[in-house]
């Protein structure tokens, strides 16, 4: 290590009126004072790799990544970003340190990523790694798409007011249920804002940009389908547009559709009809009910009636604010080491939630599935039988929800022991939490059957990172047991484990481990 140079990595933030051009530069612009990035040798890496603390900057910010090298002699260098080599011109400062700079002007998503600087000096070669990401500022938004009727045309426009401008696509499916999953061959995607073919079984519009993807389904009542056991419910916030499609198929054109709200016909201008013949010469009719901006009085039962089909209804509920309804009481589970098990949360929410499952500060993707009764469910099965606290967190524009789960894995205790000059301690994380016994091994009791009850102190402690309980038992040293072997045993319903300790060594000295089932 003595041959390694002293490396300093800094970030220089520039005022946004800079006019400099170019990417790699040896003369940084007038700017704020340099910020140290705590460059350090990355452990357990092949080769000499220094890493700087992760950098997060605003979109459109201009920055310089700079390395100061305190090493004798000349240096040569090369910047690499996304497999492209970039020009590198080192110079020397007044303290005769090598200075290498990378200027990033008007930061964009494409300029975010890993910047690698390869340096060759007379003594050694090494790499410096910078990771630059864009701060997720309010400039970036992704809003759920909504529908508008196209002026003077029987077509829907999909709109998502997002920054950067999102890519909008229609996702269409003509089969029922499971086969309408995103990657199914029955699904057709059209990357356009306007949709004319409005007769399909399942119609969704999705918008995507750097922040992800949001979709809205066209709410549909199909009079040819058996109604759900529970009345379908549609939630909207005040001011949002309402769109409900009623669809019916009949052997001929001799039928009509109508919409009613609470037994009153919808006013003209709040509905429009389309019809077409299908391949087998049956007639398909669709009737849209729409309100461009809903108010509280648009709440109620919307009923679609046909002269040839039983009518069906949906309950439209207009709310002032979004919500997430679910029970937030914490839940504890106890499972065997190889038992299959999933956490699950059942909730009702509007708008649709974004969610994560978290364990030990690691976040896991969260999938949600809609149930027939208007509820949704999210399951998490990827716990790998690790005991501890699991957190489900959900949020939408207006509400947040957190639910805690504790997972305990039934297993027999494993004992770890340590001794100091004044006491011996044993630790175990088996579950159920074990009970403890201490035994003295002596000439009278070579099998260590002589039980010790004096000076024993048991406790349980929470191991913070995993939220896992650890049980410990401490034996305070007395003259009666000094110099003897003692045995601590932890036992629960699944078995027993013991450790033997010699009580005169100053350091931790577990002697023998016994595993007794």
């Amino acid at each position: 290590n003595q041959d390694l140079p002293v490396i300093k990595c800094v970030l220089i933030n520039h005022k946004n009126n800079d006019s400099s051009v170019g990417k790699s530069s040896s003369y940084p612009m007038v700017s704020e004072s340099p910020e140290d990035l705590g460059c350090a040798l990355r452990p357990q890496s092949s080769g000499t790799v220094y890493e700087a603390a992760a950098v997060e900057v605003d979109v459109s910010a201009s920055i310089t990544l700079q390395v100061l090298v305190d090493a004798p002699g000349n240096i040569s260098c090369l910047w690499v970003f996304k497999h492209s080599s970039l020009n590198c011109q080192p110079h020397f400062d007044l303290q005769n340190r090598g200075v290498v700079s990378m200027v990033i002007l008007k930061m964009t998503e494409t300029q975010a990523g890993e910047y690698l600087l390869f340096i060759q000096s007379e003594a050694t070669n090494y790499t410096i790694l910078f990771t630059v990401s864009i701060r997720n500022t309010l400039l970036y938004t992704l809003r759920r798409p909504y529908f508008r009727k196209m002026e003077n045309q029987d077509a829907l426009v999909c709109i998502s007011e997002s920054v950067p401008e999102p890519i909008v696509e229609w996702v269409l499916c003509d089969s029922q249920g499971e086969s309408c999953k995103e990657e199914s061959p029955a699904v057709v995607k059209k990357e356009e804002k306007v949709l004319h073919e409005l007769f399909g079984t399942d119609i969704r519009c999705c918008a995507r940009n750097e922040l992800g993807r949001e979709c809205t389904r066209l709410f549909t009542i199909d009079l040819n389908q058996t109604p759900q056991t529970t009345l379908p419910q549609l939630f909207l916030k005040v001011g949002e547009p309402l769109w409900i499609r009623c669809k019916a198929v009949h052997v001929n054109h001799g039928f009509g559709l109508t919409w009613e709200l609470e037994n009153k016909a919808l006013e003209e201008g709040n509905y429009f009809e389309m019809s077409t013949y299908s391949t087998n010469r049956t007639m398909i009719r669709i009737l849209f009910a729409f309100v461009s901006s809903v108010a509280r009085n648009d709440t109620g039962y919307y009923t679609c009636s046909s002269s040839k089909h039983p009518s069906q209804s949906a309950l439209v509920t207009i709310v002032e604010k979004g919500f997430i309804n679910a029970t937030n009481s914490s839940e504890d589970y106890e499972i065997d080491q190889y038992e299959e098990f999933c956490f699950s949360v059942r909730f009702k929410a509007y708008p649709q939630i974004r969610c994560t499952w978290t364990f030990s500060r690691k976040s896991f993707p969260c999938e949600q599935k809609g149930l027939d009764n208007g509820y949704s469910i999210s399951k998490f099965c990827n716990h790998k039988h690790q005991p501890g606290e699991y957190i489900f967190h959900a949020e939408n524009d207006d509400a947040q929800f957190t639910k805690m789960f504790t997972l305990n894995i039934r297993r027999k205790p494993q004992v770890l022991a340590e001794a100091s000059a004044s006491q011996a301690s044993c630790f175990s994380d088996g579950y159920p939490l074990p009970s403890w016994t201490w035994k003295k091994c002596s000439d009278k009791s070579p099998n260590c059957t002589e039980e010790i009850t004096e000076g024993v102190w048991n406790r349980k402690a929470n191991r913070k990172v995993f939220g896992q309980w650890v049980s410990s038992s401490t034996l305070n040293m007395s003259e009666a047991i000094k110099g003897f072997l003692v045995k601590c045993c932890a036992y629960n319903s699944l078995g027993t484990s013991c450790e033997t300790i010699l009580l005169n060594s100053p350091g931790p000295f577990p002697f023998i481990q016994d595993n007794i089932s």
Partner: antibody, heavy 124, light 107 residues
Framework: QVTLKESGPALVKPTETLTLTCTVS??????????VSWIRQPPGKALEWLAH???????SYSTSLKSRLTISKDTSKSQVVLTLTNMDPVDTATYFC????????????????WGQGTMVTVSS | DIQMTQSPSSLSASVGDRVTITCRAS??????LGWYQQKPGKAPKRLIY???TLQSGVPSRFSGSGSGTEFTLIISSLQPEDFATYYC?????????FGQGTKVEIK
């Protein structure tokens, strides 16, 4: 030059609340992902870790002092603040703040730079 | 909590001696261990991080080794400026914990 400077009262009375401030310079919390911890050392004794605040504002506390500690961060002022309630003479110690860079590849080197510490005496 | 047992608690040595300090964790902490040197009235200074990586600017007579539960700090040839107290720190699991310290004194 990177510095961390602790400031706060040198003397507090039992049952009072101690508020300590760690002011950093030479780096910012806004652009570089840096965490900060508070550590204390009673006279003639070992170091004891108290609390940590990560760059994303996540916080962790010492088990034994959790109910009494609060750590927070003011990015605009480049400060990390620690409060310790219900002070007792056993809380007499030098209090240090220390920086922990956060690396995107996930490893940690713990505290690379420390403040010089501030001595706090608890006495009536 | 993870206990860090540091030994010895103090030692006397002469300039040029090889000094070994050990730290034992009560459970596996991987490589998440650092060694710090502290002189009276001063803040601790990082010597070693990630169990064995030498801090930039620290003399190469200091070295660290170990992983899991057993860790060692070695000063290959003790210098006058090395007389200080040395601490290990585990930062694998919260709460992070220090060893009780090893005071290296002049014999």
């Amino acid at each position: 030059q990177v510095t961390l400077k602790e400031s706060g009262p040198a003397l507090v009375k039992p049952t009072e609340t101690l508020t300590l401030t760690c002011t950093v310079s030479g780096f910012s919390f806004r652009n570089a992902r840096m965490g900060v911890s508070w550590i204390r050392q009673p006279p003639g004794k070992a170091l004891e870790w108290l609390a940590h605040i990560f760059s994303n504002d996540e916080k962790s506390y010492s088990t034994s002092l959790k109910s009494r500690l609060t750590i927070s961060k003011d990015t605009s002022k480049s400060q990390v603040v620690l409060t310790l309630t219900n002070m007792d003479p056993v809380d007499t110690a030098t209090y240090f703040c220390a920086r922990m860079p956060e690396y995107s590849s996930g490893w940690s080197g713990a505290f690379d730079i420390w403040g010089q510490g501030t001595m706090v005496t608890v006495s009536s | 909590d993870i206990q860090m047992t540091q030994s010895p608690s103090s030692l006397s040595a002469s300039v040029g001696d090889r000094v070994t300090i050990t730290c034992r964790a009560s459970q596996d902490i991987g490589y998440d261990l650092g060694w710090y040197q502290q002189k009276p009235g001063k803040a601790p200074k990082r010597l070693i991080y990630a169990a064995s990586t030498l801090q930039s600017g620290v003399p190469s007579r200091f070295s660290g080794s170990g992983s899991g539960t057993e860790f060692t700090l070695i000063i290959s040839s003790l210098q006058p400026e090395d007389f200080a107290t040395y601490y290990c720190l585990q930062h694998n699991s919260f709460p992070w914990t220090f060893g009780q310290g090893t005071k290296v004194e002049i014999k």
